[in-house]
């Protein structure tokens, strides 16, 4: 166990032209605070992925009001260190994100407003117990100067804080096989006490009381050899007697997530989805209020004036999660139509439309009905990049400007005669046929092929085709 400590020295305009405008003004006084997020390893992870090593928020800095006309100076900083406690071994390589936040103190409805001013990130190697490391990072026109170190909490020592130290029992020397604990020469390295019965050949521990198995061995005390054959269980072998691995323990077995968090397995470990008000690798950090600035990525915090009442983060577009910590792949929802390409600009989505299409989602076909009228009561039908008019009765042509001859297509069957009519056409059927187009033969016994002739209509009467 130990603590990562971060000391912010200055935050202000970087060198070179294009000095940023002061983030505060006489009308909108503000103050700064910082958030640090640590992840193990040299991972190049997204800013919103979990801070698996831990995170911390600074106190608020002094209130600052811009002097009119003056360039933005180095801004007043919060007092003290940012401290991120770590419970397990210090990984030696880590990634960090340091965010500079502005709290505006004007007359906003619902209390102060927070906005992210700058975010810097990096990947570093650092041994615990070493001296302060100095760093300068730039984000746009801003520059952040800071120092950091990792130190072990007694009784842990060493570059990874995994060795334990105890006061000497004898004044002159340490016990057999145990070295003095540099730099605490008056203390001796203490042997780690693993779980009782843990195999000394096949097991080891990094924390007192645990028993972790070397590859090829399993079981609570690492005494069962693993055989890779004749095992069917999804997690591997199924029976200790055959030398097969007893299924589990999976990373989520026993639910490592505290405070009602739900556990999901990841390729390398597990991930806790925490209920509102809790965060951390295992949802172990609680008592968060809006004063702690729990909403990331510009989320607005509402409620939560005291640790017992929940806060709610209202996330800006593109972010989700109870703390606005997750970026949404909004383009994966395929919002753009007609071959338009989706651009996620951060503050908004945009569809880049293909030629001939327009609209927020490329939904309008410019080659179709827009700006085109169909004459004589015709209606425009869109489709396939070319407009089409559905013409009223008696009209035809591309724009329904031509008067149609309804009899031109010879619609009356079996020798029936066609008459143009104001409402369409009428077929006068030849003897022996009936129907709107004289399509039905009249049977010799007087019955027609129709189920029944409409009342009052004799076979052979002209049929109006409507």
């Amino acid at each position: 166990a130990g603590v990562f400590e971060l000391q912010i020295h200055s935050f202000g305009p970087g060198p070179g032209p294009g000095a940023p405008r002061s983030p505060c003004s006489a009308r909108l006084p503000c103050r700064l605070f910082f958030r640090v997020c640590l992840k193990p390893g040299l991972s190049e992870e997204a800013a919103e992925s979990p801070c698996a090593l831990g995170a911390a928020l600074s106190a608020r800095g002094p209130v600052y009001t811009e002097q009119p006309g003056a360039p933005a100076p180095d801004l007043p900083l919060p007092d003290g260190l940012l401290q991120v406690p770590f419970r397990d071994a210090w990984p030696g390589t880590f990634s960090f994100i340091i965010e500079t936040w502005r709290e505006e103190l004007g007359d906003q409805i619902g209390g102060p407003a927070w906005s992210l001013l700058a975010r810097v990130a990096g990947r570093r190697r650092l041994a615990a117990g070493g001296p302060w490391a100095r760093d300068i990072q730039r984000a746009g026109a801003w520059e952040l100067r800071f120092s950091y170190r990792a130190r072990c909490e007694p009784p842990a020592v060493g570059t990874a804080c995994t060795r334990l130290c105890r006061p000497r029992s004898a004044p002159s020397r340490c016990g057999p096989g145990l070295r003095p604990c540099a730099p605490l020469e008056d203390e001796c390295e203490a042997p780690l006490v693993c779980r009782a019965g843990c195999s000394p050949e096949h097991g080891f521990c990094e924390q007192p009381g645990e028993c972790r198995c070397l590859e090829g061995w399993t079981g609570p005390l690492c005494t069962v050899p693993v055989s890779t054959s004749s095992c069917l269980s999804p997690r591997g072998p199924s029976s200790a007697t055959t030398g097969c691995l007893v299924p589990g323990p999976g990373p989520c077995d026993g639910n490592p997530c505290a405070n009602g968090g739900s556990c999901s397995e990841t390729p390398r470990s597990f991930e806790c989805t925490c209920p509102r008000g809790f965060y951390g690798l295992r949802c172990e950090v609680s008592g968060v209020t809006c004063a702690d600035g729990p909403c990331f990525n510009g989320g607005l915090c509402v409620g939560g004036a005291d640790p017992d009442s929940a806060y709610i983060c209202h996330c800006p577009p593109g972010f989700q999660g109870s703390n606005c910590e997750k970026r949404v792949d909004r383009c994966s929802l395929q919002p753009c139509r007609n071959g338009g390409l989706c651009l996620d600009l951060g503050h908004a989505l945009r569809c880049r439309c293909r030629a001939g299409f327009a609209g927020p989602r490329c939904e309008h076909d410019l080659d179709d009905c827009a700006g085109r009228a169909c004459a004589n009561g015709g209606t425009c039908v869109e489709g396939g990049g070319a407009h089409r008019c559905s013409c009223a009765l008696g009209f035809g042509g591309r724009d329904c400007r031509e008067r149609a001859d309804p009899c031109a297509a010879r619609p009356c069957a079996h020798g029936g005669r066609c008459y143009a009519h104001f409402s369409g056409l009428v077929c006068a059927c030849a003897p022996g046929y009936m129907g709107a187009r004289c399509e039905f033969p009249v049977h010799p016994d007087g019955a027609s092929a129709l189920p029944a002739a409409p009342p009052g209509l004799r076979p052979g009467d002209p049929q109006r085709y409507l």
Partner: antibody, heavy 124, light 111 residues
């Protein structure tokens, strides 16, 4: 991981047609989020985008205005590859030809994967 | 003729900060995201920055991008010898209905 493997001739005669193929592994030519490009580079013209093909419910193509009359980019779903055909070649078309993917969701213009490049010389 | 203009060369000593500019017009940089590519000698270009200021995974945070109006810039802070390469900006152009690249800037690390 995603890889693009180019194949095709290195020497083509003037007035003939250049045919290059780009085989995709680790992704799909019919992906709903990627775009598949051809780009060339020569000392005289620098980097030049030739065109792309992409799938969004159906396949679409776009070509550089200067080449529209003599370029075709075709996807081949069965072989998971896409090809470039450039007609009526002149010595001006001598360049290194690259196939690329624009595969970042929400940023199709960011060409994150590149083929190894094919040096094409147009000469009789 | 490229639609985006870059200075032909830039240089700095190790540890210095170098900035490369890219100038365009309303139809490209003014209305579309800008991307930056690094091309080491004898290799294909590599995406360095996309969507104005986003770094793909694996790109060191020494590289940062910004955009204002119709121009953009790439900054390399803490210059290192392996940064010696050609750098190109690129964007979609609404008028041409296609991608346009910058003329390229050769960065030299002075020792």
């Amino acid at each position: 991981q995603v890889q693009l493997q180019q194949s095709g001739p290195g020497l083509v005669k003037p007035s003939q047609t250049l045919s290059l193929t780009c085989a995709i592994s680790g992704d799909s030519v019919s992906s709903n989020s990627a775009v598949w490009n051809w780009i060339r580079q020569s000392p005289s013209r620098g980097l030049e985008w030739l065109g792309w093909t992409y799938y969004r419910s159906k396949y679409y193509n776009d070509y550089a205005v200067s080449l529209k009359s003599r370029i075709t980019i075709n996807p081949d779903t069965s072989k998971n590859q896409f090809s470039l055909q450039l007609n009526s070649l002149t010595p001006e078309d001598t360049a290194v030809y690259y196939c690329t993917r624009g595969g970042i969701v929400g940023a199709p213009d960011g060409f994150d994967i590149w083929g190894q490049g094919t040096m094409v010389t147009v000469s009789s | 003729q490229s639609a985006l203009t870059q200075p032909p060369s830039a240089s700095g000593t190790p540890g210095q900060r170098v900035t490369i500019s890219c100038s365009g017009s309303n139809s490209n940089i003014g209305s579309n995201p800008i991307n930056w590519y690094q091309q080491l000698p004898g290799t294909a270009p590599k995406l360095l920055i996309y969507s104005n200021n986003q770094r793909p995974s694996g790109v060191p945070d020494r590289f940062s991008g910004s955009k204002s109006g119709t121009s953009a810039s790439l900054a390399i802070s803490g210059l290192q010898s392996e940064d010696e390469a050609d750098y190109y900006c690129a964007a979609w152009d609404d008028s041409l209905n296609g991608h346009v690249f910058g003329t390229g800037t050769k960065v030299t690390v002075l020792t």
